[in-house]
């Protein structure tokens, strides 16, 4: 009986099992019972990343500088090009098809996680006892100054956006 299923790295065609083409190669002609599958290497700027029976290789991804993209890893005949974003930008999706500017953390918020080429800045509100008085891509929330440690007294309470203001203690007290 002719086969109805084939081994790994084979495919069924015309009642027989043919070898798949290895990664980096495309199918030119199916095997016969007299000759093996004919495969050809992918051309420049093309790839196939699996054992396959594709008659065309895929084009490497183009990292368009107009979209803020640059090449992180050059593609081979077996792998696609990996794009990342220019400094100060991050990918809008996992496929990294375009980039957007990193957002800054506003006053009252500190940087919890600095942005990378693939992820945006993560901000967090400054908790009580901490403040941030500027928009920043890197700065964390800073602790309020301790007036007590300086033998000073609090003249003005701190907020999430402002530091405590200390002054000399009132001697009449």
């Amino acid at each position: 009986e002719p086969p109805t299923a084939c081994r790994e790295k084979q495919y069924l065609i015309n009642s027989q099992c043919c070898s798949l083409c290895q990664p980096g190669q495309k199918l030119v002609s199916d095997c016969t019972e007299f000759t093996e599958t004919e495969c050809l290497p992918c051309g420049e700027s093309e790839f196939l990343d699996t054992w396959n029976r594709e008659t065309h290789c895929h084009q490497h991804k183009y990292c368009d500088p107009n979209l803020g993209l640059r090449v992180q890893q050059k593609g081979t005949s077996e792998t696609d090009t990996i794009c990342t974003c220019e400094e100060g930008w991050h990918c809008t999706s996992e496929a990294c098809e375009s980039c957007v500017l990193h957002r800054s953390c506003s006053p009252g918020f500190g940087v919890k996680q600095i942005a990378t080429g693939v992820s945006d800045t993560i901000c967090e509100p400054c908790p009580v006892g901490f403040f941030s008085n500027q928009s920043s891509l890197f700065e964390k929330c800073y602790p309020w100054t301790s007036c007590e440690d300086k033998n000073l007294e609090v003249l003005q309470k701190g907020t999430s956006q402002t530091n405590v203001i200390c002054g000399p203690q009132d001697r009449l007290r």
Partner: antibody, heavy 117, light 107 residues
Framework: EVQLLESGGGLVQPGGSLRLSCAAS????????MSWVRQAPGKGLEWVSG????????YYADSVKGRFTISRDNSKNTLYLQMNSLRAEDTAVYYC??????????WGQGTLVTVSS | DIQMTQSPSSLSASVGDRVTITCRAS??????LNWYQQKPGKAPKLLIY???SLQSGVPSRFSGSGSGTDFTLTISSLQPEDFATYYC?????????FGQGTKLEIK
């Protein structure tokens, strides 16, 4: 025991026809691809034609394409080669062979075809 | 068609010698190559398939190697019955094609 026995060879004039047969025994004939290979006197081997098992696809060397036809009769366990428009350069011993995993593991003893006027 | 070129075309050797026959394909055929032995007046016999696999019943003194375009058949210690003509045959592209043969003669 696997056996392949060719017949039908002989002397034929240029432009003439001949039909070779190969009687198979000792194995399940229908399950195997079969081929014809020839050898001109004092020369090397030349693959002429092949026929698949289940699909029955047929394949030919460019030198015989359009002139030779390979066929099989699984009920008779017999392989055929119909040779038309024969030329002097077709003179050779013709072998039938069984295929397994892209190799010819059993061969007949051959039949001589002579094309001459 | 893929051209198969064997070298040498003929060679003389003695019983017990180690002999190497080479076969070169005009383009890459991976490991899709067979070797056959033919004695005068007889049909060819399959020795090696898939470049390096020994056909059942063939003595272990025969071995094959190579891939891509360059292949070798080695007989480690020649026996009297090994004097014959050897052919390589590719099956990487249609149609299958043979080398011109290497005649191994007694010195």
């Amino acid at each position: 025991e696997v056996q392949l026995l060719e017949s039908g060879g002989g002397l034929v004039q240029p432009g003439g026809s001949l039909r070779l047969s190969c009687a198979a025994s000792g194995f399940t004939f229908s399950s195997y691809a079969m081929s014809w290979v020839r050898q001109a006197p004092g020369k090397g081997l030349e693959w002429v034609s092949g026929i698949g098992s289940y699909g029955g696809g047929t394949y030919y060397a460019d030198s015989v394409k359009g002139r030779f036809t390979i066929s099989r009769d699984n009920s008779k366990n017999t392989l055929y080669l119909q040779m038309n428009s024969l030329r002097a350069e077709d003179t050779a011993v013709y072998y039938c062979a069984r295929y397994v995993n892209f190799g010819m593991d059993y061969w007949g003893q051959g039949t001589l075809v002579t094309v001459s006027s | 068609d893929i051209q198969m070129t064997q070298s040498p075309s003929s060679l003389s050797a003695s019983v017990g010698d180690r002999v190497t026959i080479t076969c070169r394909a005009s383009q890459s055929i991976s490991s899709y190559l067979n070797w056959y032995q033919q004695k005068p007046g007889k049909a060819p016999k399959l020795l090696i398939y898939a470049a390096s696999s020994l056909q059942s019943g063939v003595p272990s003194r025969f071995s094959g190697s190579g891939s891509g375009t360059d292949f070798t058949l080695t007989i480690s210690s020649l026996q009297p019955e090994d004097f014959a003509t050897y052919y390589c045959q590719q099956y990487g592209r249609n149609p299958p094609t043979f080398g011109q043969g290497t005649k191994l003669e007694i010195k």
